[in-house]
Amino acid sequence: AGVFELQIHSFGPGPGPGAPRSPCSARLPCRLFFRVCLKPGLSEEAAESPCALGAALSARGPVYTEQPGAPAPDLPLPDGLLQVPFRDAWPGTFSFIIETWREELGDQIGGPAWSLLARVAGRRRLAAGGPWARDIQRAGAWELRFSYRARCEPPAVGTACTRLCRPRSAPSRCGPGLRPCAPLEDECEAPLVCRAGCSPEHGFCEQPGECRCLEGWTGPLCTVPVSTSSCLSPRGPSSATTGCLVPGPGPCDGNPCANGGSCSETPRSFECTCPRGFYGLRCEVSGVTCADGPCFNGGLCVGGADPDSAYICHCPPGFQGSNCEKRVDRCSLQPCRNGGLCLDLGHALRCRCRAGFAGPRCEHDLDDCAGRACANGGTCVEGGGAHRCSCALGFGGRDCRERADPCAARPCAHGGRCYAHFSGLVCACAPGYMGARCEFPVHPDGASALPAAPPGLRPGDPQRYL
């Protein structure tokens, strides 16, 4: 067991051109805070994957207001360290994500607003108990300077916090076979409970007599470094001579991940993907709960009030992400129906509807014909958000108010002549054609193509189109 400690030294514009504007202003004062997320191993993981080693939020920094016209300086920082406790052995290799958040203190609807300013990530090797390691990371135009270390919590000592120390029972020396605990020379190693010969640097045990290896080490006593370059299979146990992993039982056999964690094999060992609210190599440690205030942007934390349960953030409209940290482009979900225009006003979503549609999402098709009269015996037809009149013969236009010239469209085929008639139009067909629109040729034997001429009409007579 132990604690990972992170000390932020400065956060401000990086060197070079294109200095960022200050995130705060006289109109919008703000303050910073930081979040650190730790994961075991050197895996390149997405920012959203669980912080299996743990996570921590800093306190809020002092309120800062930009001086008009001044370049963005290093911004005032929160006091104190970010501390991430770990219950298991320190893995030696780890990945980190450090996020810089801005809390806007203007007159925000619903309380302060949070936004992510910068996120840096890295993969490091670190022995517990060592000195502070200094680091500089850049995210866009911002630069973050920080130091970190891992320290063991008594009675644990060693580079992995797996050796146990106890106060000396005698003032001058430790008991038989027990060494002084460097650097705590006034303490002694506790009696060994691991398997005899288990490497004190690279092995640890949770049960008497066992010897479990830290990442990168193998063998019954964890004394053989893993070399994957000449190995055929990523499974143990190890061949003591080459250090290669040879086929054997899989590290995920029996699922070592607690609390519903899912196990995945890695080239050297296994990794647990923990459900929200749990962390540790085997998901055995409960992590962030509602008491840590993990929900940003007005999100409500649901569940997790007791230390052993996970939390869920119910995000207000316009935000998403496991911590409500991401602003949603709500219009990208195309909520406005029937071709409505979407407007995201921040506090609400609005749809500007096309003619003929109404409702919050333009979901209501208005009765296009309501109150619309079609003149001269025309009938109203709904459709597409606009009314349309189907006009009686001899009339046209949007409302059937225009007297139509039925011959304007040249309706008579094959050279037939068109005559306007009070009830429509009449086609006088050219020789050899018949039909209402002169569309049918008359066959040489006198028989016409379908349809037959109506009784009382000879081919070539004018055909009245009623």
Epitope: G110, G111, P112, G298, G303, G318, A348, P360
Partner: antibody, heavy 118, light 108 residues
Framework: QVQLQESGPGLVKPSETLSLTCTVS????????WTWIRQPPGKGLEWIGY???????NSNPSLKSRVTVSLDTSKSQFSLNLSSVTAADTAVYYC????????????WGQGTMVTVSS | EIVLTQSPGTLSLSPGERATLSCRAS???????LAWYQQKPGQAPRLLIY???SRATGIPDRFSGSGSGTDFTLTISRLEPEDFAAYYC?????????FGGGTKVEIK
């Protein structure tokens, strides 16, 4: 101007289900979370539960097994069902709109008194 | 759940005086997600303050909120006749959403 109006029976028999509806006018029901709160006579306020058009709901654990909150976007209404009522459920029931940047309640209905009695 | 305790239960003051109402949480409210409401007899509550210190739309500036963590305060700088009512605090940091028991501000 957003307005909320509660409706439902004012008298419910013990062991029956209390059913109330809140009609929202003046804004889209899809833009906000919507909630129910109650206040027994002469006492303080108690949150019952909320709903969002996406289907997200949450309710007070002290009532959870008895509470159902639902929403009908087409009618711009949301509803409360509280089953197995007793005299202790007698209260003024309020519907309210949830703030868009935090779960405070910025617009309230005028409230409806529900008495549980045989 | 977070239990909110309001004090005093009743505050007897005269118009023009300063009123200070307290709301104490049983555990830390992480994000200053605390609201204050005013309720007059026979009416629904009205939101006064959100985010511990921001006034809601249309609320006079004699109402102010402060505090963080577990201790929050609503101050009415000069009581007007219409301010005599019951006042409730509510936290919206962690579910279940909870209200305080209320403080009644009455005319002395």
């Amino acid at each position: 101007q957003v307005q909320l109006q509660e409706s439902g029976p004012g008298l419910v028999k013990p062991s029956e289900t209390l059913s109330l509806t809140c009609t929202v006018s003046g804004d889209s029901i899809s833009n906000y979370y919507w909630t129910w709160i109650r206040q027994p006579p002469g006492k303080g306020l108690e949150w019952i539960g909320y709903i969002y058009y996406s289907g997200t709901t949450n309710s007070n654990p002290s009532l959870k097994s008895r509470v159902t909150v639902s929403l009908d976007t087409s009618k711009s209404q949301f509803s409360l069902n509280l089953s197995s009522v007793t005299a202790a459920d007698t209260a003024v029931y309020y519907c309210a709109r949830v703030f868009n940047r935090g779960f405070a309640f910025d617009i309230w209905g005028q409230g409806t008194m529900v008495t549980v009695s045989s | 759940e977070i239990v909110l305790t309001q004090s005093p239960g009743t505050l007897s003051l005269s118009p023009g005086e300063r009123a200070t109402l307290s709301c104490r949480a049983s555990q830390r409210i992480s994000n200053t997600y605390l609201a204050w409401y005013q309720q007059k007899p026979g009416q629904a509550p009205r939101l006064l303050i959100y985010g511990a210190s921001s006034r809601a739309t249309g609320i006079p500036d004699r109402f102010s909120g402060s505090g963080s963590g577990t201790d929050f305060t609503l101050t009415i700088s000069r009581l007007e006749p219409e301010d005599f009512a019951a006042y409730y605090c509510q936290q919206y940091d962690t579910s279940p959403l909870t209200f305080g028991g209320g403080t009644k501000v009455e005319i002395k």
